[in-house]
Amino acid sequence: DSSKWVFEHPETLYAWEGACVWIPCTYRALDGDLESFILFHNPEYNKNTSKFDGTRLYESTKDGKVPSEQKRVQFLGDKNKNCTLSIHPVHLNDSGQLGLRMESKTEKWMERIHLNVSERPFPPHIQLPPEIQESQEVTLTCLLNFSCYGYPIQLQWLLEGVPMRQAAVTSTSLTIKSVFTRSELKFSPQWSHHGKIVTCQLQDADGKFLSNDTVQLNVKHTPKLEIKVTPSDAIVREGDSVTMTCEVSSSNPEYTTVSWLKDGTSLKKQNTFTLNLREVTKDQSGKYCCQVSNDVGPGRSEEVFLQVQYAPEPSTVQILHSPAVEGSQVEFLCMSLANPLPTNYTWYHNGKEMQGRTEEKVHIPKILPWHAGTYSCVAENILGTGQRGPGAELDVQYPPKKVTTVIQNPMPIREGDTVTLSCNYNSSNPSVTRYEWKPHGAWEEPSLGVLKIQNVGWDNTTIACAACNSWCSWASPVALNVQYAPRDVRVRKIKPLSEIHSGNSVSLQCDFSSSHPKEVQFFWEKNGRLLGKESQLNFDSISPEDAGSYSCWVNNSIGQTASKAWTLEVLYAPRRLRVSMSPGDQVMEGKSATLTCESDANPPVSHYTWFDWNNQSLPYHSQKLRLEPVKVQHSGAYWCQGTNSVGKGRSPLSTLTVYYSPETIGRR
């Protein structure tokens, strides 16, 4: 209630002679600060004096001074909330009740705390989980109701007297709620720990033994078994007898059932600790063990490998891989059930023994077509020789061999002929399924392996074929040697290198790109007229009249070919100039007279110049000179000059006569 002082501290504190005691304590006074504090040992209230009697262990005065004999007991509190105490060392006769007499200005209070001091260090207490199972991690706890700042202690774990390897976690509590030291050890017990003694040992700071607690481990585990076999090596021959015995070395709790297993499968009607096998067969070879169960579960013994020995059985051959590609590697494996394993092998190819081959495997690094056939083997061990099995077939596949392209036509072949070729080969595995031809063309294949070239081209030089199964084998190309008339006939100017001017020396060449056969004849023509039979056509001094369209022909025994018409252009200065007059060379004054400069030139005249009868140049640049209105004084001789890139030419004089008009004559 509100009339009480409020204290918090452990109800009882434990210690032993020579140790110390630390008393955590808090309080709240009814009013004001603490003015006086006395620590009594076993206080008793005296009704007569209205005071407490008993041994005063500690007393604080108003001036705060403490007598020197009180140093064993220390008040570590304050005037308003902390009332912590320390007694160091603590003695056996300190056991009993401690009384904390508190006085404030107006209020008083006596708070009691129990102190239990034993003669010797008391033992810690080991706490175990309700059940321990093998290989399942458990936590072992060692608890001691003691802790004091001035007296360090340690808790150590031992198994059968030997310190345990596992790391323990030690914790301490010095609070108003509890005072203790605790050590926790995480531990995965094995079945072999069953019945073993675990100790928690209390030691002082120097590791000196103070006290301990011990427990015996009860580790639940499946039955632990040992198997024994006669004969001890478990190697027998067909018809022999074998005995196996199962012994339980440990089980917690007790076992309940027994059974036997072969290769992991339970043997029916075998529920005793002894297994008798009479007149064994090779099928009884295998791994045997016994299984015994308890409430935790089944336990199994180690496996015993029973080997029933026998001579090799008929062998089979495994080929890696068939079909095999020529040039690849192949491995043959002789497979024969036998115990012990065969020590020697004999190999056969197509029924004939293969010399020097005595291993289980035969390796051929580079397979050739003749390696194909049936492979068989015989295995042998100490008990005898097996029989030869049916064998395995090796199929060696390879591209078609010795492929050739054959021309079926009579020779020579001429351009435009129909040519038939066949593709032949010597052998092939697998069979040839298709053929390829080079170069590709829009050609006919009337039957497999036959090619027909209609209208053979002049440039069909060589043909090659390939016979194909899974692979293609190409034959060497065969030359068709097609004969044809001369090709690409054209006229080429050899000289001059630039344009042809009148008077130049000119050479034309009749060129062709190819001809088969090579022997050729030449013909030159102009406007259907034969000019020459040489490869060149020569002009010592070309004239404008030589200009025109030229063609050359080249022929061989196959035929003749003409060039495209080639135009020979001769450049020459203006010539044959003359002045023509319109409407005529006699014109009436006042009318219009047009003078035209006519010429023959190649290239055409680019510039005209006009002159009068005194060779005075007139200011006209055109082919036509127009005088309008024409005057009588314009009568006279006129001439023109034409200019092109080659040169100049001039006309002869042409006379213009301008006569008076009737009006003028009338005026005179």
Partner: antibody
Framework: EVQLQQSGPGLVKPSQTLSLTCAIS??????????WNWIRQSPSRGLEWLGR?????????DYASSVRGRVSINVDTSKNQYSLQLNAVTPEDTGVYYC?????????????????WGQGTMVTVSS | QSALTQPASASGSPGQSVTISCTGT?????????VSWYQQHPGKAPKLMIY???NRPSGVSNRFSGSKSGNTASLTISGLQAEDEADYYC???????????FGTGTQLTVL
Amino acid sequence: EVQLQQSGPGLVKPSQTLSLTCAISGDSMLSNSDTWNWIRQSPSRGLEWLGRTYHRSTWYDDYASSVRGRVSINVDTSKNQYSLQLNAVTPEDTGVYYCARVRLQDGNSWSDAFDVWGQGTMVTVSS
Amino acid sequence: QSALTQPASASGSPGQSVTISCTGTSSDVGGYNYVSWYQQHPGKAPKLMIYDVSNRPSGVSNRFSGSKSGNTASLTISGLQAEDEADYYCSSYTSSSTLYVFGTGTQLTVL
């Protein structure tokens, strides 16, 4: 330095004759490498060549087809001048009239450009 | 005889180049190498700048140059200056009875 000096009235009545004179200094009208030209300029027709006269062994003249029949160029060699007569004028003939020389020889090669111009005469055809 | 075709206007900043074209036919520009170019300032008579396609009279700046391709002639003025602002006309000899034909004119503005 060749100079061309123009003279003549600035106003002419429609249907009358326009008459302009071009006096030459620094060159002779009788030069056999020159021609003497009349050119006019108006906002509607731009620059327009009207005709020319020149002397070689005799006098020659050429006219633009647009004015042929109502134009003539006359020469006065004694005064070294030439004139333009344009008959039956209309307001369409309003513009600035120029005389100009063409020198046809440039060294050894032919040439053809109006290299010397008169100052121009503004002629208005209006009643 | 119709006039030679020129752009109505052209412009450029000082220091820049400008080119004026002049298009005719094979009877004039294309047929003869007698193309000339004239500069005309307001109220003044035309002044010959280029003759015979690409020749420069003495006294004319070498910033002015002429050329011809087919039926089109061109005048190029490089390094434009304020005094280049004027009207420019081309002219050509022609094979018709009207012996000379002029261009429509181009007004050049120096920005």
